[in-house]
Amino acid sequence: GAVQKELQHIVGSQHIRAEKAMVDGSWLDLAKRSKLEAQPFAHLTINATDIPTGSHKVSLSSWYHDRGWAKISNMTFSNGKLIVNQDGFYYLYANICFRHHETSGDLATEYLQLMVYVTKTSIKIPSSHTLMKGGSTKYWSGNSEFHFYSINVGGFFKLRSGEEISVEVSNPSLLDPDQDATYFGAFKVRDID
């Protein structure tokens, strides 16, 4: 909606300026254009080989950054966290899919709180803030063969170099391990004025 239009306006105007640089032949504008191409971004997909076993809220630390759809540029992935290298306004997003098939076993409880939390941690001033959360309480009856639930959150945030983004979920054993199902990412939209 409104956020998408604003992003299109910001990103679109930057592309127009970059294209103008080609016409004008200005080296200064060309430098700006190359800077645009180096805008930080990351798209991380779940690495399901090391999923925690509890049902409580846990931090997901295993993500792919360089295989399949996963890519990263001018950001750092370390110890399960996405680290900001450049100050700026970023669009953050996360998509989490939960699923259960009867062949996976019997659920310990049919009432499930399926949640995602996207958190920002600052090292310089030790603090942690939940930037986004989403989810629902579900009743996954044993009478059904298959259950599925998807959460998508996204938002626009001012981030500083060194700040870390992490993702926490409840009931991680229920995560859908496919790269098109469980992922998070960020891309820089503009500098801080």
């Epitope: 076993t53 509890g54 049902s55 409580h56 846990v58 062949t103 996976s104 076993g105 019997d106 659920l107 310990a108 409880t109 009432y111 009931n171 991680p172 054993s173 229920l174």
Partner: antibody, heavy 122, light 107 residues
């Protein structure tokens, strides 16, 4: 480190009651199902009861149904077993054990308490 | 309830031997089987879960296999620390049962 510390065992007369406790530390207690397993002197392991991570689901072996009650207090990280109408056949070492998976049943028990002895004798 | 039958009840072996213990379920339990090791006066220790998954920290000489009604625990090369009693444990529809145990003793 991850551990379960048990208390509450002892000698009790037939027909009386006893409550066992199991204090958890080193892991998020509220995220895991918990079991009680017993072992009679010189015998094998015998599953007694289980409770889900949130306390909503409880299951019992036929031999203790209606006599034993499992409960938990997640704010105190403690598991309980209330035993009533005790008989000599309940004499055993009782172990509390953590379920390996919090979400699913069936994955086994990966952390065990040290055991506490319950002797039912007149 | 599902009955679990372990064989043999007692097994005499030497250090370095390859040892196999069998566990049979009275009806299919898919892969919902765990193996434990217990030493005298101590609590059991989880070795294998879901029939073949090795528990964290357990030596790789231990392995599990099988599905349905027949399962095996194998110790590829028996070590002095492995002399103990081993139990299988099944899960099926909100019921858990243990096998009667297999004692592995020094030959």
């Amino acid at each position: 480190q991850v551990q379960l510390v048990q208390s509450g065992g002892g000698v009790v007369q037939p027909g009386r009651s006893l409550r066992l406790s199991c204090a958890a530390s080193g892991f998020t207690f509220s995220g895991y199902g918990m079991h009680w397993v017993r072992q009679a002197p010189g015998k094998g392991l015998d599953w007694v009861t289980v409770i889900s991570y949130d306390g909503s689901n409880k299951h019992y072996a036929d031999s203790v149904k209606g006599r034993f009650t499992i409960s938990r207090d997640n704010s105190k990280n403690t598991l309980y077993l209330q035993m009533s109408s005790l008989g000599p056949e309940d004499t055993a070492v009782y172990y509390c054990a953590k379920s390996l998976s919090g979400t699913y049943w069936g994955y086994g028990m990966d952390v065990w308490g040290q055991g506490t002895t319950v002797t039912v004798s007149s | 309830d599902i009955q679990m039958t372990q064989s043999p009840s007692t097994l005499s072996a030497s250090v370095g031997d390859r040892v196999t213990i069998t566990c049979r379920a009275s009806q299919s339990i898919s892969s919902w089987l765990a193996w434990y090791q217990q030493k005298p006066g101590k609590a059991p220790k989880l070795l294998i879960y879901k029939a073949s998954s090795l528990e964290s920290g357990v030596p790789s000489r231990f392995s599990g296999s099988g599905s349905g009604t027949e399962f095996t625990l194998t110790v590829s090369s028996l070590q002095p620390d492995d002399f103990a009693t081993y139990y299988c444990q099944q899960y099926n529809r909100y019921s858990w049962t243990f096998g009667q145990g297999t004692k592995v003793e020094i030959k």
